[in-house]
């Protein structure tokens, strides 16, 4: 059920920096039995269901909703990061009555921290990962999916937010990082540059790949994503980047070939239900670990990140659909909606394999390799 | 109270055709993917066709394909199936269910609806 | 023949615990798709009984329970209760057929 269209499972190379998207750019649905907040009427969202900030949107949970769209959020904000060699353009502005973090772009003012203060935080996301500076873990176990197959109906909403292209997900599709460290998927969201210009949002050695898609996910426990903003593992999300392959990948074009139908801003549409978890890497075990923050304001820190070692391959038909086909608030390209990379400052990325170890081509000169932190969690 | 109210049946010869419906209330109806299950005399349960909450997209049963239209009335909270050509083997209680649970059960079902297909 | 294969029948004292299996394949049950349960009381619509290969809508005994491995998933009925006895069913999706499958249905009998 996997995608067979992964690239090798060669650690992941590269390095750039870009924009952060925990909550703030993708909504986030609420858990399946848990109360959510509703996003403002007006909005096309079902009932029950409401707008958080952070990593795209992020909405709280609520009850099994009677309705076929049960679980809707709306867009959250996000912030701009600083410094960006690549800086992405002006184009993801969200303004939302009544949100204190609408008024936030990517590339450009208001600063972040003016936005929310969090975006000035310490531990913040994304990150550049450096598979020799990572420390293995060996209790860093494969990933557990379930639930992750849909049925085509009910069908799911995907909605052009502004910042991103947003798929809300439906209750039950469960994740576990761990024992005792379990999850519920909420929505994923997707972040890519523009022609010629790469725009993930992680890079790896100062490498950044095309694109980068987030499954946003709560832990199971708490019921809403606002009581989990800022906690230490309320929330968690699963990166993996998309690169270029020769063949078109049938699990995105699902959702890419409806892309046009979301052109405009604020505008959704109702998609097939599909296997969510053919959108991953095949490979669950090996992947970078560490907490950081969503990569969108309100920029909340104590999100778990895990990062596949193993990408995603599209054609690049698809890549150029999936940068060259939404548009932003006003007349601007839906483009280079990433966060700069940010510093780690002491914080260590684990690693659930030997990373360090004939990994990178780059490995010439002997490195202190950490030592891993976590050490049965 | 959250119900759906079917309506339609009768007898009919082969080759005949029939339309059923499927009145909600109680509940959204426009927000909610809709099937028809028909379960034959002493037999089981066999989903016949489905829609989604818009309308836009349909799906069949091979058994059905060509000959059974399922369509909906959001402004009239209502589900229809158009059955044409109809055979001996469509003889059935027919169910219109929702399929609002988004694990892919159906969580709210009609009385049901005879139809008896003979010369 | 049904997609989804149940026992014809089952049957259990009253206290007792019974179970009736569904077994599917690897284009249904086994791709990852959830089974859910229906009971069908005799000249009535079947009522939707576990959902999400273990969920309970709400108004459904908790004697009432299901799993799922692999190909194959179970309803359980513990301290069976003379109305129980009636007809069960298991339904999921199949991306092979491009449809909602059923079982063939299983009837429980409480001696």
């Known amino acids: 059920q996997r995608l067979p269209r992964m690239q090798e499972d060669s650690p992941l190379g590269g390095g750039s920096s870009g924009e952060d998207d925990p909550l703030g750019e993708e909504d986030l649905p609420s858990e399946e039995d848990s109360p959510r907040e509703e996003d403002p009427p007006g909005e096309e969202d079902l009932p029950g269901e409401e707008d958080l900030p952070g990593e795209e949107d992020l909405p709280e949970v609520k009850p099994k909703s009677e309705e076929e769209g049960s679980l809707k959020l709306e867009d959250l904000p996000t912030v701009e990061a600083p410094g960006d060699p690549q800086e992405p353009q002006n184009n993801a502005h969200r303004d939302k009555e009544g949100d204190d973090q609408s008024h936030w772009r990517y590339g450009g003012d208001p600063p972040w921290p003016r936005v929310s203060p969090a975006c000035a935080g310490r531990f913040q996301s994304p990150v550049d990962i450096r598979p020799q500076l990572a420390a293995f873990c060996p209790a860093l176990r494969p990933l557990e999916l379930l639930g992750f197959q849909l049925p085509p109906l009910p069908e799911l909403r995907l909605r052009n937010n502004g910042h991103s292209v947003q798929l809300t997900l439906p209750p039950g599709l469960e994740m576990a990082l761990g024992p005792g460290r379990e999850y519920r998927a909420l929505q994923l969201h997707l972040h890519w540059g523009a022609a010629g210009r790469p725009g993930s949002e992680h890079t790896v050695e100062g490498h950044r790949f095309p694109a980068e898609i987030h499954v946003v996910h709560l832990s199971t426990a708490f019921a809403r994503v606002d009581e989990a903003l800022g906690r230490p593992g309320g929330l968690a999300v699963l990166a993996a980047f998309l690169e270029e392959g020769p063949e078109e990948n049938s699990a995105y074009e699902q959702l890419l070939s409806r892309l046009e139908e979301i052109a405009e801003e604020g505008s959704e549409t109702q998609v097939p239900g599909l296997d969510i978890s053919a959108l991953l890497p095949s490979d669950f075990s090996r992947y970078f670990q560490y907490e950081g923050s969503l990569t969108t304001p309100p920029c909340a820190q104590g999100v778990i990140w895990t990062v596949f070692n193993q990408t995603v391959m599209l054609s690049a038909k698809q890549l150029h659909t999936l940068s060259d086909t939404l548009w932003g608030p006003g007349d601007s390209r839906l483009q280079l909606n990433f966060r700069a990379t940010q510093p780690l400052n002491g914080r260590v990325i684990e690693a659930s394999f030997p990373a360090g170890v004939d990994s990178s081509p780059r490995a010439a000169e002997p490195v202190q390799l950490n030592s891993c932190l976590a050490a049965g969690d | 109270e959250v119900q759906l109210v079917q309506s339609g049946g009768g007898v009919v010869q082969p080759g005949g055709s029939l339309r059923l419906s499927c009145a909600a209330s109680g509940f959204p109806f426009s927000s909610y993917a809709m099937s028809w299950v028909r379960q034959a005399p002493g037999k089981g349960l066999e989903w016949v066709s489905a829609i989604s909450a818009n309308g836009g997209t349909t799906y069949y049963a091979d058994s059905v394909k060509g000959r059974f239209t399922i369509s909906r009335d959001n402004s009239k909270n209502t589900l229809y199936l158009q059955m044409n050509s109809l055979r001996a083997e469509d003889t059935a209680v027919y169910y219109c269910?929702?399929?609002?649970?988004?694990?892919?059960?159906?969580?709210?079902w009609g009385q049901g609806t005879m139809v008896t297909v003979s010369s | 023949q049904s997609v989804l294969t149940q026992p014809p029948s089952v049957s259990g004292a009253p206290g007792q615990r019974v179970t009736i299996s569904c077994t599917g394949s690897s284009s249904n049950i086994g791709a990852g798709f959830d089974v859910h349960w229906y009971q069908q009381l005799p000249g009535t619509a079947p009522k939707l009984l576990i959902y999400?290969?273990?969920n309970r809508p709400s108004g459904v005994p908790d004697r009432f329970s299901g799993s799922k491995s692999g190909t194959s998933a179970s309803l359980a009925i513990t301290g069976l209760q003379a109305e129980d006895e009636t007809d069960y069913y298991c339904q999921s999706y199949d991306s092979r057929l491009s449809a909602w499958v059923f079982g063939g249905g299983t009837k429980l009998t409480v001696l």
């Open positions: 999400g290969n273990t």
């Open positions: 269910a929702n399929n609002g649970n988004y694990r892919g059960a159906f969580d709210i």
